[in-house]
C-alpha cells in the first residue's frame, strides 16, 4: 500500500484546504524535474531559471554560463543545441507544432568564439529537423523534406535528397504513421558515432489514403488539411534507408542499404537503426504481420564503397503468442566489441529479460530472470550494464535502477536506487554522461518528484539537483487525497489496481466511484507516481473514490497477460474492469448506484464498450476522442494487435469490436462523447460514427467537439473540457455544484 | 583497372532518338553512382545527368529534363541515356564519368553524337 | 545554378615557369565541393585535384589547389610539356553540377 502522509490533524484542520478545479487547470501543483544535458563525462549544460545556458563541470566544481539570456532573447530562442566542437550553438525560435513529436522552427547559429551569430549562408525557414554531427560541428537538417549537410555552420549548404516533396516524398522526417507508431521521434536521421556517415530513411507516402479534415480557422471558408495516413489494411509507405558520406558526399551520393530478403518479400517496416562503429550499422525490420523481426547488422566495404549486410548477421526475434516485443520492437545496446550486444525481449517463460546476443539468437545469455520485467537497458559500459526493471518487491509498477557488473564473473546485481528513499522513491529514470562517469535519478513519486546527481562508480549521491521545495511548501495545507496501490487475484489473473481515496475516507460510508481507464496493449496505469491531477481533485473535493485498473493487454507482468488481446481487441480490456469494479463493490465502500467510466483515446473506446457491456453497472460515462472501429485507426498500430480487416484474417472481429455495434446498450447509461475536430490521430470521424449510430438507435447522450483542436484538446479547451466533465460527474453522481 | 567504354553515338535527324551505352569495369558498378557529360564541339562541359548506384534516383540538367532518361543494368555492368526528341543544340561528344555531383574520377572515351538534318 | 568563371581564358607560358589559374563561383562553394580537371586535345578530362583540395591519384605533386569560399586557384609550380592543356574546375555542391569555361594553357 501506498499512503500519502495525511497531514489533517483536528488542530489544522480549518487550515488545510481540498483542492479546487482551478488548482489542476493553474497547474499550480506541477513539479520540476532536471534532466542534465550532458556533454562529456562530467559536464552538462542546463538551463537558469533566468534562461542562461550554464556550463556544469562536476569535478571542478565550477560552473560558467555559456550563452546569455540576452543573446537567447535576442532571437527569441526557446531552445538550444551545443556544438560537439563548442564552437557554435543553434538557437531555435519561431516553434511551431505539427503532430505529436515533430514540429518546425527557425534556427539560428551563434559563434561562441566570436560572440557573434553566423552571417551568411544563414539556414532557410521554417526547418523540419536540425542537428550537429557527434563531433566537430559539421549540420545536418531536414528542408521541405529533404536533407542537406554543412561541413561548418557558414559553409553553403550540400543538398543531398531532391525528391523531397509534400505529403509525398520525406526524407530524414517520418510520415505521420511512423512518427507516430514507429519510431516516436520528429528525425529520421542518424550520425554515426565520429560523424563520418550519415544514415537517413525516405518514406514514399504516394500511394497512401489520405484523411482530409476541415480546419476552421477565422476565414470565410475552412482550409482543408490532407495528411497520408494508412488506416487499418491500407497501403502503407515505402521505406528505404539511405548512407552517405558526410567527408565527399557528391562523389558516390547516397548509398541504400540491402533489406534483408525475408523481410522484402511482403510488405514491411523499418523499426529503428543503430551506429555501432563508424562502419557498421544495426538496422531493424518488421514484417507488415508484425510477429517477426530482423535484426540486421551491416558493414561498410571501403572497396565497394557499399553497405554489406550478411546473412550471417541477421538476427531473427518471433512471437508465436502475440506480436514481436512490447509496445515496440526492442532496440540493442552493443557492448565494447561492436558485435554482440545486449537487448530485451521475452525468454521461455514469457517475461522481457535482458539478454546477451554474441552469434545467435538461439545462443543468447539470458542476463536478467523471474516473474518480472526489464524495461530499460541505460547504459553498457566495460565493466557494467545499467537498467530498469520491476523486480523490488514484486510491484509492477514501480521502476527501480539496477546496474549488473559484466566484467567480473559470474556478474554480480546490485539495486542503485531501490534504498534511496524508499518512500518517497519507488519510480526512477536514469541519465547517464559519457562513460557513466556520472547519472542522474529523476524520482516520479509516489512522493514529491526528485532529481539527483550520482558518480558512477560508486553510486554515492553527490547533489541533488531539483527537490521541488515549492511545491512541497505549498501543499502543506492541502487536503491530498490517500492513494492505494494493492491487486486483486480473478480466476488466475492478477489485476492490479491503484485507488485514490477522499482525505477523509471512511470504510463505513459510501462512496461515488470513478474509474479512470486507458488500458491500451502495452500500457501501464498503475505506476508508483506522484501527481496532482484532474482526479486528484475529484477525491479531494468531491468525495469520490477514483480507480485505475491495470487489466490483461497491459504491460510489464509477462506475456500471458500482455498478449491475452492478441487479435481481440475490446473484449478482455472491458471484461477486467468490469470484474475489478464488482470486486470494488465487495468491499463495501461504493455506493453502487453511483459509478461511472471514463477515458481518453484507447480508454475512450474502453469506456464506451464498458458503459455499453449491458452490466448496469455503470451509471453514467465519459469517452474523449475515443477509437470507435478499428477499421478508422492507424494500420502500424492497429494491425500489430489485430492482424488485418480481410476476410481470410481477422475481418470479423474488426466488425465485431465496434462501438456502434453496441449502440442499442447505451440506452440506460448517461454518456458523455467529446472530440477535437482537428484530431490528426484518432480522427473525429470515430466519434462521427458513434453518433450516427446512437441518433440512428435514437438513444439520447451528450456530445462536446471542440473546434480546430487535435487529440491532446490543450489550451483553453483544457480548461472548458475539464469543467464539462466535471459538471458532467457531478450531475450523475447528485453532488451539489 | 577502371574503364568506361561508351557506344551508341552517330548522326540522328532532329526529333529523333538515340541510346547510348556506357560498359564499365575494374570496380564494383552497383555501389557508385554515374554520371553523363557532354561537351559541344569546341566548348566546355556541361553535365547531363546522373544515377545514384541501385538505380533507385534519377537527376538530369534543366536543358534535356523530360527528352532524356538514364538508366542502369548492374546485372551487366552497364549505363544508358536514351535521348528522345534530339535537337541540333544537343550535338556534343557524350561522356561517361564514375561519380555522382563530383569529382568524376573516371572518364570513358566519349561517343559523339551528331544532330543534323 | 552555380556559375563558375575562369581567368585567364588562355595562359601563355614556357616549361619550367609556374601557372596560376583561378576559379570564381557566383555563390560559395567551399574546398570541400571543388575540383579540377585536365583535358587534352581529343582526349577525356582527367581528374587532377580531388575534393578538399586533394591530388587524385597518380597527379604529380606540382599540381596543387587552394581557395575557399568563391575563390579558388589551381597551380602548376613547374610546367612540363605534357602540362600544356584545357584545365576546368567544377563545383559539385549544388544540381546541376556545373563546370568553368575551362583555361587553355598553352606554350609561349
Known amino acids: 500500500i501506498v499512503l500519502r502522509p495525511s497531514r489533517v490533524h483536528n488542530s489544522e484542520e480549518n487550515t488545510m484546504r481540498a483542492l479546487t478545479l482551478k488548482d489542476i487547470l493553474n497547474g499550480t501543483f506541477s513539479y520540476k524535474t532536471f534532466f542534465p544535458n550532458w556533454i562529456s563525462g562530467q559536464e552538462y549544460l542546463h538551463q537558469s531559471a533566468d534562461n542562461n545556458i550554464v556550463l556544469y563541470n562536476i569535478e571542478t566544481g565550477q560552473s560558467y554560463t555559456i550563452l546569455s539570456n540576452r543573446t537567447m532573447k535576442s532571437v527569441n530562442a526557446s531552445n538550444y543545441g551545443l556544438s560537439p566542437d563548442r564552437q557554435f550553438v543553434y538557437l531555435e525560435s519561431d516553434y511551431s507544432k505539427l503532430w505529436r513529436y515533430s514540429y518546425t522552427a527557425t534556427y539560428y547559429i551563434y559563434d561562441l568564439s566570436n560572440g557573434e551569430f553566423v552571417r551568411g549562408n544563414e539556414l532557410p525557414r521554417p526547418i523540419q529537423y536540425l542537428c550537429w554531427s557527434p563531433v566537430g560541428s559539421k549540420l545536418a537538417y531536414v528542408y521541405q523534406n529533404n536533407i542537406y549537410l554543412k561541413q561548418r555552420p557558414g559553409d553553403p549548404p550540400f543538398q543531398i535528397t531532391f525528391n523531397g516533396r509534400e505529403n509525398k516524398i520525406f526524407n530524414g522526417i517520418p510520415d505521420w504513421v511512423y512518427e507516430e507508431e514507429m519510431l516516436a521521434t520528429k528525425y529520421a536521421l542518424w550520425w554515426s558515432p565520429n560523424g563520418k556517415f550519415l544514415a537517413y530513411a525516405e518514406f514514399n507516402d504516394t500511394d497512401i489514403p489520405v484523411i482530409a479534415y476541415s480546419y476552421y480557422g477565422d476565414e470565410q471558408y475552412p482550409r482543408t488539411i490532407n495528411i497520408p495516413y494508412p488506416k487499418a489494411g491500407a497501403k502503407n509507405p515505402v521505406v528505404r534507408i539511405f548512407i552517405i558520406d558526410t567527408t565527399y558526399p557528391a562523389y558516390v551520393g547516397p548509398q541504400e542499404v540491402p533489406v534483408p530478403a525475408m523481410i522484402a518479400s511482403s510488405d514491411y517496416y523499418f523499426s529503428w537503426l543503430t551506429w555501432v562503429t563508424d562502419e557498421r550499422v544495426c538496422l531493424q525490420w518488421l514484417k507488415r504481420v508484425q510477429n517477426v523481426s530482423v535484426l540486421s547488422i551491416c558493414d561498410f566495404r571501403e572497396d565497394w564503397q557499399t553497405w554489406d549486410c550478411p546473412k550471417t548477421q541477421e538476427h531473427i526475434e518471433e512471437s508465436r503468442t502475440g506480436w514481436a516485443g512490447g509496445f515496440f520492437v526492442s532496440t540493442p545496446v552493443f557492448s565494447y566489441d561492436a558485435i554482440s550486444y545486449y537487448k530485451i525481449f521475452s525468454d521461455k517463460d514469457g517475461y522481457k529479460h535482458i539478454h546477451y546476443i554474441k552469434d545467435t539468437v538461439e545462443n543468447a545469455i539470458q542476463i536478467t530472470s523471474g516473474k518480472w520485467e526489464a524495461i530499460n537497458i541505460f547504459r553498457v559500459t566495460q565493466d557494467s550494464l545499467f537498467y530498469s526493471s520491476n523486480e523490488f518487491e514484486e510491484y509492477p509498477g514501480r521502476r527501480n535502477i539496477y546496474r549488473i557488473s559484466i566484467g567480473s564473473y559470474p556478474p554480480s546485481k546490485k539495486c542503485v536506487t531501490c534504498h534511496l528513499r524508499k518512500e518517497r522513491c519507488q519510480y526512477y529514470t536514469a541519465s547517464f554522461s559519457d562513460y557513466a562517469k556520472y547519472y542522474a535519478l529523476v524520482c516520479y513519486g509516489p512522493g514529491i518528484p526528485i532529481s539527483t546527481l550520482h558518480d558512477g562508480r560508486t553510486d554515492q549521491e553527490i547533489k541533488i539537483l531539483e527537490e521541488n521545495k515549492e511545491l512541497e511548501n505549498a501543499l502543506k495545507n492541502i487536503q491530498l487525497p490517500k492513494e492505494e496501490i494493492k491487486k486483486l487475484e480473478v480466476d488466475e489473473i492478477t489485476l492490479w489496481y491503484k485507488m485514490i481515496l477522499p482525505p477523509q475516507f471512511d470504510r463505513s460510508k459510501k462512496y461515488p466511484l470513478l474509474i479512470q481507464v486507458y488500458g491500451g496493449p502495452c500500457s501501464q496505469s498503475v505506476r508508483s507516481v506522484f501527481a496532482v491531477n484532474w482526479i486528484s481533485y475529484l477525491a479531494s473535493k468531491e468525495g469520490m473514490v477514483i480507480a485505475l485498473v491495470d487489466g490483461r493487454g497491459t504491460a510489464f507482468q509477462g506475456d500471458k497477460l500482455l498478449y491475452a488481446v492478441y487479435r481481440k481487441l475490446g473484449v478482455y480490456e472491458v471484461e477486467d474492469q468490469i470484474t475489478a469494479v464488482r470486486k470494488f463493490i465487495e468491499m463495501g465502500f461504493i455506493d453502487e448506484k453511483r459509478i461511472a467510466i471514463w477515458g481518453w483515446s484507447y480508454g475512450g473506446y474502453v469506456s464506451s464498450l464498458a458503459l455499453a457491456s449491458g452490466t448496469g453497472l455503470f451509471k453514467c460515462g465519459i469517452a474523449v476522442a475515443p477509437v470507435s472501429s478499428w477499421e478508422y485507426y492507424a494500420s502500424v498500430y492497429t494491425e500489430r494487435f489485430m492482424g488485418l480487416p480481410t476476410k481470410d484474417d481477422n475481418l470479423e472481429h474488426y466488425k465485431n469490436s465496434t462501438v456502434m455495434a453496441r449502440a442499442e446498450y447505451f440506452r440506460n447509461v448517461d454518456y458523455l462523447l467529446i472530440h477535437g475536430t482537428a484530431d490528426d490521430n484518432v480522427h473525429f470521424q470515430n466519434s462521427a460514427q458513434i453518433a450516427k449510430a446512437l441518433v440512428n438507435a435514437q438513444v439520447d447522450f451528450q456530445a462536446m467537439w471542440y473546434s480546430d483542436q487535435n487529440h491532446g484538446l490543450s489550451g483553453l479547451s483544457t480548461n472548458h473540457l475539464y469543467t464539462h466533465m466535471t459538471h458532467f460527474l457531478k450531475q450523475c453522481f447528485s453532488l451539489s455544484d | 583497372e577502371v574503364q568506361l567504354l561508351e557506344s551508341g553515338g552517330g548522326l540522328v535527324q532532329p526529333g529523333g532518338s538515340l541510346r547510348l551505352s556506357c560498359a564499365a569495369s575494374?570496380?564494383?558498378?552497383?555501389?557508385?553512382?554515374m554520371s553523363w557529360v557532354r561537351q559541344a564541339p569546341g566548348k566546355g562541359l556541361e553535365w547531363v545527368s546522373a544515377i545514384s548506384g541501385s538505380g533507385g534516383s534519377t537527376y538530369y540538367a534543366d536543358s534535356v529534363k523530360g527528352r532524356f532518361t538514364i538508366s542502369r543494368d548492374n546485372s551487366k555492368n552497364t549505363l544508358y541515356l536514351q535521348m528522345n526528341s534530339l535537337r541540333a543544340e544537343d550535338t556534343a561528344v557524350y561522356y561517361c564519368?564514375?561519380?555522382?555531383?563530383?569529382?568524376?574520377?573516371?572518364w570513358g572515351q566519349g561517343t559523339l553524337v551528331t544532330v543534323s538534318s | 545554378e552555380i556559375v563558375l568563371t575562369q581567368s585567364p581564358g588562355t595562359l601563355s607560358l614556357s616549361p619550367g615557369e609556374r601557372a596560376t589559374l583561378s576559379c570564381r563561383a557566383s555563390?560559395?562553394?567551399?574546398?570541400?565541393?571543388l575540383a579540377w580537371y585536365q583535358q587534352k586535345p581529343g582526349q577525356a578530362p582527367r581528374l587532377l585535384i580531388n575534393?578538399?583540395?586533394r591530388r587524385a591519384t597518380g597527379i604529380p605533386d606540382r599540381f596543387s589547389g587552394s581557395g575557399s569560399g568563391t575563390d579558388f586557384t589551381l597551380t602548376i609550380s613547374r610546367l612540363e610539356p605534357e602540362d600544356f592543356a584545357v584545365y576546368y574546375c567544377?563545383?559539385?555542391?549544388?544540381?546541376?553540377?556545373?563546370f568553368g569555361q575551362g583555361t587553355k594553357v598553352e606554350i609561349k
Open positions: 564519368a564514375k561519380g555522382w555531383l563530383g569529382p568524376f574520377d573516371y
Open positions: 567544377q563545383q559539385g555542391i549544388m544540381l546541376p553540377p556545373t
Open positions: 575494374g570496380f564494383t558498378f552497383s555501389s557508385y553512382a
Open positions: 555563390q560559395s562553394v567551399t574546398s570541400s565541393y
Open positions: 575534393v578538399g583540395s
